[in-house]
């Protein structure tokens, strides 16, 4: 990470993408350590900010305002040089969010993908944003940036992610910006969880009392595996939301979750997946599909005593 040729390395923690009112720590790493440093904000004047103040190890900037957005550099303390300071560091762009209404983020073909596939994340808005930015939660490097394409009163950008590996799974958000303030970003889109499946062995899915039930009869779907999955995810074909439950170790050394579906009113095809707490967005292969049939008087929907997960939140731990 070190900058070469007497250049320090400037970084931001936890991220270069900072919400209005939030805080960010700027760290200037120089000569195998964090020394005294000066910070510069590259407005066209290239004048040191903070009235030439000297910082030790890191500087916590905030609460940030749109004026904090921009490009920063640092110089490390170098007592025996002519100037007393190192060459300027790498440029670091700080982006401040919450300055415009949020865009929308969609995944094509969908947010559940097999390892090795490619997904298109489309960020769009009825605001004519000039640029769109895509950022993955927990990542400190700069977000990806694309120019918005304007068509039929909508501005959009298509970010191609892939081939998918576990490291690319996670929670994504996108932002928009306008020309005169390219680093003053919009509010974040709603989070979108990109899940990679097919990395571990498939669990088995069964129905109690069985896959064919009478209308009104209580049905429970059980997902189990010899693998020590922490969480099971149950999806129904044609439904956007998955349900999830913590896996429970059983006496037969399997790990199981029982999803009560309530009184049967409507059939459907179900699949389940397992995942580990450490990598909540990396799932197993799908179980074999299970077709649940209801005899008698089917209605149009199945009640959900198990609270469905929100549109996002898959990639956050179950507490």
């Amino acid at each position: 990470l070190m900058g070469g040729q007497d250049k320090p390395f400037l970084s931001a923690r936890p991220s270069t993408v900072v919400p209005r009112g939030g805080h960010v720590a700027l760290q200037c790493h120089y000569r195998r350590g964090f020394n005294n440093f000066m910070l510069y904000k590259e407005d066209r004047s290239h004048v040191p900010i903070f009235h030439g103040r000297i910082f030790q190890e890191s500087f916590i900037m905030g609460p940030v305002t749109p004026a904090h957005a921009g490009t920063y550099r640092c110089r490390g303390s170098r007592p025996h040089s002519l100037t007393g300071w190192s060459a300027p560091s790498n440029p670091l762009v700080i982006m401040v969010t919450g300055n415009h209404r949020k865009p929308s983020l969609l995944a094509h073909p969908g947010p559940l993908l097999k390892s090795g596939e490619t997904v298109i994340l489309q960020c769009w808005s009825d605001i004519m944003f000039e640029h769109f930015f895509l950022h993955r939660e927990g990542i400190s490097e700069d977000p990806s940036r694309l120019v918005g394409q304007i068509h039929d009163g909508v501005s959009k950008a298509n970010f191609s992610i892939g081939p998918l590996m576990p490291v690319l799974a996670g929670t994504y958000r996108c932002y928009g910006s306008v020309p005169h303030s390219p680093y003053q970003l919009s509010a974040p889109s709603d989070p979108l969880d990109i899940v990679i499946t097919g990395l571990y062995e498939k669990p088995s899915l069964s129905a109690q009392p069985g896959p064919t039930v009478q209308a009104g009869e209580n049905v429970t779907l059980s997902c189990s595996s010899w693998s020590s999955y922490d969480i099971y995810h149950l999806s129904r074909e044609g439904e956007a939301h998955e349900r999830r439950l913590r896996a429970v170790p059983k006496v037969n050394r399997t790990f199981q979750a029982d999803f009560p579906l309530g009184p049967a009113t409507h059939g459907g095809t179900y699949r389940c997946f397992g995942s580990f707490r450490a990598l909540p967005c990396v799932w197993s292969n799908s179980s074999d599909p299970l077709l649940v049939s209801v005899t008698g008087n089917p209605s149009s929907s199945w009640p959900s005593p198990t609270e469905p997960s929100s549109k996002s939140g898959i990639c956050r731990h179950l507490h």
């Epitope: 749109p66 300055n99 415009h100 209404r101 009825d126 004519m128 000039e130 306008v178 020309p179 005169h180």
Partner: antibody
């Protein structure tokens, strides 16, 4: 369709205050910032600044810092320009214009400052 | 501040003639330039944004070109209704700045 309708002409004495309104329709008001532009008689256009309609934050060009104030009434999709302590050189037509590239303009409000 | 130099400041042209107005920025403004038409007693009309993108409803005889520092607005075949004052605007950086204007009159 998108429309910006400004309030009518104003005749004021030096030292007084004027408040011009700009009512937007045909789009989501908070989607686009509102710019204000001055045109003095026989002169060109001068950008005064803009107000972020999402956050309410105004930004003023150097020549318009101090006596000039931008404000919003978001519920009424209306932006305002207030000029305090009017001077003769404030006599001009003032335009509101929305969006980063000033896509749509109001019809202008003539402010005349005269004793 | 970025200075926008527009030329000519005024011109006469005949109906059907091809007319070009230029605008030069004092520094690189990417393609963040708009063109406007002003007529007495009317709202200014936005013709072009992003240097070359025609605003919906603007006749196709208007076109814009350029990037960086040098830009131009062209009317391919002048019509009577095109007389007025034309302004360029850079919106790459705050404060926005307009060119000085070009008064276009019919010969």
């Amino acid at each position: 369709q998108i429309q910006l309708v400004q309030s009518g002409p104003e005749l004021k004495n030096p030292g007084e205050t004027v408040k011009i309104s700009c009512k937007a329709s045909g789009y989501i008001f908070t989607n686009y910032g509102m710019n204000w532009v001055k045109q003095a008689p026989g002169k060109g256009l001068k950008w005064m600044g803009w107000i972020n309609t999402y956050t309410g934050e105004p930004t003023y060009a150097d020549d318009f810092k101090g006596r000039f104030a931008f404000s919003l009434e978001t519920s009424a999709s209306t932006a305002y320009l207030q000029i305090n302590n009017l001077k003769n050189e404030d006599t001009a037509t003032y335009f509101c214009a929305h969006g980063p590239w000033l896509a749509y303009w109001g019809q202008g409000t003539l402010v005349t400052v005269s004793t | 501040d970025i200075k926008m130099t527009q030329s000519p400041s005024s011109m006469y042209a005949s109906l059907g003639e091809r007319v070009t107005i230029t605008c030069k920025a004092s520094q690189d403004i990417n393609s963040y330039l708009s063109w406007f038409q002003l007529k007495p007693g009317k709202s200014p009309k936005t013709l072009i944004y992003r240097a070359n993108r025609l605003v919906d409803g603007v006749p196709s005889r208007f076109s814009g070109s350029g990037s960086g520092q040098d830009f131009s607005l062209t009317i391919s075949s002048l019509e009577c209704e095109d007389m007025g004052i034309y302004y360029c605007l850079q919106y790459d950086e705050l404060p926005y700045t307009f060119g000085g204007g070009t008064t276009l009159e019919i010969k």
